[in-house]
């Protein structure tokens, strides 16, 4: 149940009052307002929206609302020198060219400044050569090509389908394989759900639709020119050659009409198996190069985008806490979009706006939260989580001492089937308890709780009667707070049925067709799913900011630590001989997990029994809870990834979007059978087990009685 212990509390100023104030109609109105023109990071339009949000948050009643600006590296196409891909004949004549723009959707034909599809941060270049089809360009796809099929991508232009993993990982893999260019395309197998029409008649991707996106491999660095430090007025900037995470080969995205023209001519090797075939009427031959009649034709890329240091603006709103103003609960989501941002990000920004309005209403009636709530509208998320990361770098000393929790608020929907939550184990019980108190918006679950519909539609693979909650990965603005600073974090949105819809993300992701009408006509006409997401996100913030004892359960961390230790041990045990040869033992890790479990259990008992009227003891216990996530941070970071410092979780090295548990050990074990120096490789496994065991033990000790 919600706790109602803020100062000036009256019976009506509780969680229920906050939730009842949230209105679907307001979210709808805000979404419309935020999606009428493009709000690309670094543009005047997005600056104007920042000022509008600042003004409205002030009107809603926040104590202060400031703009925080940074000068960061962004990337834009050259207006006079467009990006495109050609097929050229033996004389060098262009016999086919890909489209420059997506056809604008109905009603938007006359909107100016739609940015054409491009891969942000692609270097300039005009490589030409034979094409190799590399499936999703995952690590395992290149293993298949290089090791099994003996196909060499060196000096080739590779074409990869979007989906499964973050596009930046695809580009990194292609670079490592020696490719000299990358073409990314959306295959209907991944972006066209059967039985649904393409936009504007349905929510599927039309043939001319293209997914934009950055192709960086920042590994949490933020602005590529100022890693570790804010990109402020006196910043020292690296030269472009030393910038973090920039791709070294040209990259460009296309739609499936244009992809068809490239893929239909492919020759060379047949696809290795059916998992390499999409839904186009093409053979999905791997290449290299075109088939017989077209073997003299080549592919040529024309990429002229430029990287430019550009000013960006975050909006930071503060609602001061009445009892513990030096404890911060943060709700943040981005404002910048690739084009109209109908789903990404404005379905999230509209929810944040309504949450701010509801908190403001309570504040105007004399209420304050116990702890300070910070609201953030981040800029330049689409260019590498830049706004949130720069702000966190600027405020890192405050955040690491005062940060209680961060709740992310990007897209509120990626479907309309059920809830999806990714969070720290510390928040599992908070999420369970909250969703038991909320009504389900789902058809067939009238009068039932959100917890019930969520559990039915997305059951936990481990625990019956409980819903699935996933690990945090990255690809969104929680990254710096969780992976770098160790602040307990969570995110929630409505999602699709992953069992029946196997396409990646939602079909119109990052295309011009992500409009207000897409949401209003096809995803959530009544805005009931948006309202539910507002209740979940807002409810989490309310409880984190207002409960006397922080709603964190350290016992849930103990449970997952054991699960993750079992998993990594079983991966290692695929090499029993080497484990014996190199004396690899997981005893220290299992011992640390056992200690953590026992200490967490005792701490939880003390948490039930202590005198909550003693403010010193209360603050002490809450600080132990707040700092538990921080205790999993290794100041040295993970190997070659200094800004990923969480020892229990990191974004997968093979897919930024996915979370990996015990990532240091996992990466040390990955493909270990192919390492040239097995002794050194297994030595690194042992070192990573040591780091993990030490960290778990050290974290456990923060929960012990203080003296």
């Amino acid at each position: 149940k919600s706790s109602n212990e803020a100062t000036n509390i009256t019976p009506k100023h509780n969680m229920k009052a906050f939730l009842d104030e949230l209105k679907a109609e307001n979210i709808k109105k805000f979404l419309y307002n935020f999606t009428q023109i493009p709000h690309l990071a670094g543009t005047e339009q997005n600056f104007q929206l920042a000022k509008q949000i600042q003004s409205q948050w002030k009107e809603f009643g926040l104590d202060s609302v400031e703009l925080a600006h940074y000068d960061v590296l962004l990337s834009y196409p050259n207006k006079t020198h467009p990006n495109y891909i050609s097929i050229i004949n033996e004389d060098g004549n262009e016999i086919f060219n890909t489209s420059l723009f997506e056809p604008p959707p109905p009603g938007y034909e006359n909107v100016s400044d739609i940015v054409p599809p491009f891969s942000a941060f692609s270097p300039q270049g005009m490589p030409e050569g034979d094409l190799v089809y590399v499936n999703y360009a995952r690590t395992e796809d290149f293993f298949k090509l290089e090791r099994d099929m003996k196909i060499n991508c060196s000096g080739k232009i590779v074409i990869a389908r979007y989906g499964k993993v973050f596009r930046g990982n695809k580009v990194k893999n292609a670079q490592l394989a020696g490719a000299k260019g990358v073409i990314l395309y959306s295959d209907p197998a991944d972006y066209f759900a059967p039985g649904v029409k393409s936009y504007p008649d349905g929510w599927n991707l039309p043939g001319g639709g293209v997914q934009r996106g950055n192709i960086l491999n920042l590994n949490g660095a933020g602005d590529p020119l100022t890693p570790g430090y804010p990109a402020n007025e006196y910043a020292y900037r690296r030269g472009i050659a030393e910038a973090v995470g920039l791709p070294s080969i040209p990259v460009h995205p296309i739609g499936y009409y244009d992809a068809q023209k490239l893929l239909e001519k492919m020759g060379g090797s047949a696809p290795p198996d059916s998992s390499w075939r999409g839904s186009l009427k093409v053979p999905y031959n791997v290449g290299p190069g075109f088939t017989g009649n077209f073997s003299t034709q080549k592919v040529k890329m024309h990429i002229h985008s430029t990287n430019e240091v550009t000013r960006i603006y975050n909006v930071i709103g503060t609602l001061r806490g009445a009892v513990e103003p030096d404890r911060y609960v943060i709700l943040g989501g981005h404002r910048d979009s690739w084009v109209f941002g109908g789903i990404d990000p404005q379905s999230g920004a509209a929810v944040v706006h309504e949450i701010v309005r509801s908190f403001g209403t309570l504040k105007k009636e004399g209420w304050r939260p116990r702890r300070t709530i910070l609201f953030a509208s981040w800029d330049a998320e689409e260019f590498g989580l830049l706004g949130s990361t720069e702000w966190a770098e600027e405020n890192s000393r405050l955040l690491q001492e005062r940060g209680v929790a961060y709740i992310n608020a990007d897209s509120s929907i990626e479907g309309n089937y059920t809830l999806r939550v990714d969070c720290t184990p510390l928040m599992y019980s908070l999420v369970h308890n909250l969703t038991k108190e909320l009504k389900s918006p789902d058809e067939g679950f009238e009068g039932k709780s959100l917890y019930e519909s969520w559990t039915k539609k997305s059951p936990s693979p481990e625990f019956s009667g409980m819903p699935r909650i996933s690990k945090l990965g990255s690809g969104n603005d929680f990254e710096v707070f969780f992976q770098r600073l160790g602040i307990a974090s969570g995110r929630a949105r409505y999602t699709k049925n992953w069992e029946t819809n196997k396409f990646s993300g939602y079909p119109l992701y990052h295309s011009v067709y992500e409009t207000y009408e897409l949401v209003e006509k096809f995803y959530d006409p009544m805005f009931k799913y948006h309202l539910t997401v507002a209740q979940v996100r807002g409810g989490m913030v309310f409880e984190l900011a207002n409960s006397i004892v922080l709603p964190f359960d350290c016992r849930d961390y103990a449970v997952v630590l054991r699960k993750y230790a079992d998993k990594i041990y079983s991966i290692s045990m695929k090499h029993p001989q080497e484990m014996k040869t190199y004396s690899v033992s997981f005893d220290s890790l299992f011992s640390a997990v056992k200690n953590f479990t026992e200490i967490a259990s005792k701490f939880s008992e003390r948490l039930q029994d202590f005198d909550k009227s003693n403010p010193i003891v209360l603050r002490m216990m809450n600080d132990q809870l707040m700092f538990l996530e921080r205790a999993f941070i290794d100041p040295l970071g993970l190997p070659d990834r200094p800004f990923y410092r969480h020892v229990i979780y990191a974004p997968s090295s093979h897919n930024k979007y996915a979370g990996e548990s015990f990532p240091g050990i996992y990466d040390a074990l990955f493909d270990i059978e192919s390492k040239v120096d097995p002794s050194k490789a297994w030595g690194e496994v042992k070192r990573q087990i040591y780091v993990a065991a030490f960290t778990v033990q050290a974290a456990a000790e923060t929960l012990s009685e203080v003296a």
Epitope: N97, E109, N110
Partner: nanobody, 114 residues
């Protein structure tokens, strides 16, 4: 400054044919997707046909099988061949493309009447 210059159109009997042309003065448009729209009196503007730089085409259901969109990139010109015309095809036809902003032809009246 890019111009889209339309020609063709006029009065034709039901069942007849017409060909519309749209020439552009910009080299960029040779490699851009082009469209034909139409607007009948008192009705909303309607997308009729689309052709990508690579020649992929799309048609409104109402004109499928009767209209053909094509382009000649050497002449920077796009065409709309309209066969089996019906009274409901009567409208002002516009060619259109987009490159950071909208570019429209001046419009061509097509009237189908006996």
């Amino acid at each position: 400054q890019v111009q889209l210059q339309q020609s063709g159109g006029g009065l034709v009997q039901p069942g007849g044919s017409l060909r519309l042309s749209c020439a552009d003065s910009g080299s960029i448009f040779r490699i851009n997707t082009m469209h034909w729209y139409r607007q009948a009196p008192g009705k909303q503007r309607e997308l009729v046909a689309t052709i990508t730089s690579g020649g992929s085409t799309n048609y409104a259901d109402s004109v499928k099988g009767r209209f053909t969109i094509s382009r000649d990139n050497t002449k920077n010109t796009m065409y709309l061949q309209m066969n089996s015309l019906k009274a409901e095809d009567t409208a002002v036809y516009y060619c259109y493309t987009y490159y950071y902003r909208a570019y429209w032809g001046q419009g061509t009246q097509v009237t189908v009447s006996s």
